[in-house]
């Protein structure tokens, strides 16, 4: 349904508060270096303009597209060339090329200072002094650091952020109330950002078909009682929502997400029995709840899959008539029967099935050719099962920190060209799979673990894409979305790598390490471990363990010393010498 003024339409649909918040997120995600005050000014100007269009949709410029309006506004920023360099060239382009240009310049790893959390009293004062500015600043800081954050979900985070301050700034022990809530929001926010980044990468790098396949599999697992036609409708709508958000069309995205939540709740009887509680919540909570809802129970008496997809003489006829629909039905039927499989495994099975049909439907005896296709699935299913079993055993044996270290060594040996901060970040996140998933029973382990690993490996892929240094990473990241994890798992030690020159400065530590949090201290040690492996890629586990144990003892000793700095200087030299000797450097 065409509207005379798109900006007026979205303003009316979303309301002023959400409109302003979403425009701020959009601008901060595009111009990640701009100061907060500049963005607020731009948002206010756009909002005032939108109000004139609501009053009179025929007013000047009200008929322009949102991309045109927002792009024109962004291009008024005076310091565009100095701050963003070649991104300023986007402004010479016309829509839709201009928006595409802005999208291409989104930076997954912007050079921004780490967000330091002020004292609780300072935060509470700021919250009370100007609640609106305080919350806008939250949106701005998150959006600029996470340029693909799912905007309607960020509104939900902001609502929880506000609720935390409203409650805790009145509490007797403000810190005890607030800090755990902020930690939870931070951790959930990082996870949400990473999950959405994978969706956008899927759409942008592998196309709509890849995203739709993912959505069919996931929604079929979640809503196994829903008919295929219903799942297909939800997939189409969900694809539109994520395409919009990943494309920077945040107003349309938020509006369509709300419509989708409304539709799901109006039709929950034919979708899932688990939606009742979600559908009683307000909009933002409702949408979040639906996105996280547990899988419904599988219908009783589901027939054999083989009947329609292997034994039937009509397989090739059905496939030829509508390939994607037939493959979609296969994926739907397989996924609804297998909540115990990861989505990526289901997609691998569907790909194997498709490849078999492509080959067999051209053969002299198609049925004879594809009769054993399900046998080909067995090794594909067993590979992640075995990998998860082995790694959960290792995790239970080592604990999270040492499990992360094992992964750090493993991945540094696979792709030593990758920057140390990236290897540390990715390996730490890979290691979190243990505490996240190994506690689950067998039936939930694979969907938890492998789909989580897909999210983490996508972080590696997007960070590496910005500054490509390893052909092996590029290959695993670009060849197949669903085979990324098996591709990385299959990598052995990179024999072509020339060890990094030894630099004593890398292994020089100071007393400041003693005041760091446990997490920060771990990161320091893990950074040193990666550097060790880069210097000595052929070092054995035992050698590395010995050096790391010595290093931990050194830090502990010097942090207890009266003259910490002297201890770090003197004992540090001894440690470096001993480590060089131990590793034969």
């Amino acid at each position: 349904d065409a509207h005379k003024s798109e900006v007026a339409h979205r303003f009316k649909d979303l309301g002023e508060e959400n409109f302003k918040a979403l425009v701020l997120i959009a601008f901060a995600q595009y111009l990640q270096q701009c100061p907060f005050e500049d963005h607020v000014k731009l948002v206010n100007e756009v909002t005032e303009f939108a109000k004139t269009c609501v009053a009179d949709e025929s007013a000047e410029n009200c008929d322009k597209s949102l991309h045109t309006l927002f792009g024109d506004k962004l291009c008024t920023v005076a310091t565009l060339r100095e701050t963003y360099g070649e991104m300023a060239d986007c402004c010479a382009k016309q829509e839709p090329e201009r928006n595409e240009c802005f999208l291409q310049h989104k930076d997954d790893n912007p050079n921004l200072p780490r967000l330091v959390r002020p004292e609780v009293d300072v935060m509470c004062t700021a919250f009370h002094d100007n609640e609106e500015t305080f919350l806008k600043k939250y949106l701005y800081e998150i959006a600029r650091r996470h340029p693909y954050f799912y905007a309607p979900e960020l509104l939900f985070f902001a609502k929880r952020y506000k609720a935390a301050f409203t409650e805790c700034c009145q509490a007797a022990d403000k810190a005890a109330c607030l800090l755990p809530k902020l930690d939870e929001l931070r951790d959930e926010g990082k996870a949400s950002s990473a999950k959405q980044r994978l969706k956008c990468a899927s759409l942008q790098k592998f196309g709509e078909r890849a995203f739709k396949a993912w959505a069919v599999a996931r929604l079929s697992q979640r809503f196994p009682k829903a008919e295929f036609a219903e799942v297909s409708k939800l997939v189409t709508d969900l694809t539109k929502v994520h395409t919009e958000c990943c494309h920077g069309d945040l107003l349309e995205c938020a509006d369509d997400r709300a419509d989708l939540a409304k539709y799901i709740c109006e039709n929950q009887d034919s979708i899932s029995s688990k939606l009742k509680e979600c559908c009683e919540k307000p909009l933002l909570e409702k949408s979040h709840c639906i996105a996280e809802v547990e899988n419904d129970e599988m219908p009783a008496d589901l027939p054999s899959l083989a009947a329609d997809f292997v034994e039937s003489k009509d397989v090739c006829k059905n496939y030829a008539e509508a390939k994607d629909v037939f493959l979609g039905m296969f994926l739907y039927e397989y996924a609804r029967r297998h909540p115990d499989y990861s989505v990526v495994l289901l997609l691998r099975l569907a790909k194997t099935y498709e490849t078999t049909l492509e080959k067999c439907c051209a053969a002299a005896d198609p049925h004879e050719c594809y009769a054993k296709v399900f046998d080909e699935f067995k090794p594909l299913v067993e590979e992640p099962q075995n990998l998860i079993k082995q790694n959960c055993e290792l995790f239970e044996q080592l604990g999270e920190y040492k499990f992360q270290n094992a992964l750090l060594v493993r991945y540094t040996k696979k792709v030593p060209q990758v920057s140390t901060p990236t290897l540390v970040e990715v390996s730490r996140n890979l290691g979190k799979v243990g505490s996240k998933c190994c506690k689950h029973p067998e039936a939930k382990r694979m969907p938890c673990a492998e789909d989580y690993l897909s999210v983490v490996l996508n972080q590696l892929c997007v960070l590496h894409e910005k500054t490509p240094v390893s052909d092996r990473v590029t290959k695993c990241c670009t060849e197949s979305l669903v085979n990324r994890r098996p591709c990385f798992s299959a990598l052995e030690v990179d024999e072509t790598y020339v060890p990094k020159e030894f630099n004593a400065e890398t292994f020089t530590f100071h007393a400041d390490i003693c005041t760091l949090s446990e997490k920060e201290r771990q990161i320091k040690k893990q950074t040193a471990l990666v550097e060790l492996v880069k210097h000595k890629p052929k070092a054995t586990k035992e050698q590395l363990k010995a050096v790391m144990d010595d290093f931990a003892a050194f830090v502990e000793k010097c942090c207890k010393a009266d003259d910490k700095e002297t201890c770090f200087a003197e004992e540090g030299k001894k440690l470096v010498a001993a480590s060089q000797a131990a590793l034969g450097l």
Partner: antibody, heavy 121, light 111 residues
Framework: EVQLVESGGGLVQPGGSLRLSCAAS????????MGWVRQAPGKGLEYIGI???????YYASWAKGRFTISRDNSKNTVYLQMNSLRAEDTATYFC???????????????WGQGTLVTVSS | DIQMTQSPSSLSASVGDRVTITCQSS????????LSWYQQKPGQPPKLLIY???DLASGVPSRFSGSGSGTDFTLTISSLQPEDFATYYC???????????FGGGTKLTVK
């Protein structure tokens, strides 16, 4: 007792619609393809179409577009929706259980008693 | 459309006779053997006798047998019994489930 029972037949005017039901008892419909076959008074058997266990439908060329087969496994029932009915559609309509699950083998080993549909003004 | 031709269309025989009915399809049936035979008595639904050209359906007496392949098939009743007087139909399954077809029928009556 394992059986199929058709219902929904009766007198209908030309151009009208009718939905026939076939309820299964004593077994689950989800394990076999279910077909519909008709027999005009004093004539032979005529295949209409079939629905597979997974819901794939296949129709005789003459039935395509006017007739629709569906199933509701939770109700253990198969349906035949008939539109734009003509006098020549007057027949006893049988539902039948195929030996196969995913296609029509032509071997229907369990039949209902049939329901008579009369198309007349 | 695929045609199934049964012959004869009617046949008179006596108890104890050996009876043969043939069925010819205009195209080869699926896997060369996807052919069934049915018996129907007035006011009753059809009853499956033979499937896959020669396999006897459950509960069917062994005097009934089927043979043939491709396009030509035969139903044989080795020794006719009083309860065998009925109409017999063949049905073929083809490479598409849409093409399943019945023969015109053979009415077997008492001579």
């Amino acid at each position: 007792e394992v059986q199929l029972v058709e219902s929904g037949g009766g007198l209908v005017q030309p151009g009208g619609s009718l939905r026939l039901s076939c309820a299964a008892s004593g077994f689950s419909l989800s394990s076999n393809a279910m077909g519909w076959v008709r027999q005009a008074p004093g004539k032979g058997l005529e295949y209409i179409g079939i629905i597979s266990v997974g819901g794939f439908t296949y129709y005789a060329s003459w039935a395509k577009g006017r007739f629709t087969i569906s199933r509701d496994n939770s109700k253990n029932t198969v349906y035949l929706q008939m539109n734009s009915l003509r006098a020549e559609d007057t027949a006893t309509y049988f539902c039948a259980r195929d030996r196969h699950g995913g296609d029509s083998s032509g071997a229907f080993y369990l039949w209902g008693q049939g329901t008579l549909v009369t198309v007349s003004s | 459309d695929i045609q199934m031709t049964q012959s004869p269309s009617s046949l008179s025989a006596s108890v104890g006779d050996r009876v043969t009915i043939t069925c010819q399809s205009s195209e080869s049936v699926y896997s060369n053997n996807q052919l069934s035979w049915y018996q129907q008595k007035p006011g009753q639904p059809p009853k499956l006798l033979i499937y896959d050209a020669s396999d006897l359906a459950s509960g069917v007496p062994s005097r009934f047998s089927g043979s043939g392949s491709g396009t030509d098939f035969t139903l044989t009743i080795s020794s006719l019994q009083p309860e065998d007087f009925a109409t017999y139909y063949c049905a073929g399954g083809f490479s598409s489930s849409s093409d399943t077809a019945f023969g015109g029928g053979t009415k077997l009556t008492v001579k």
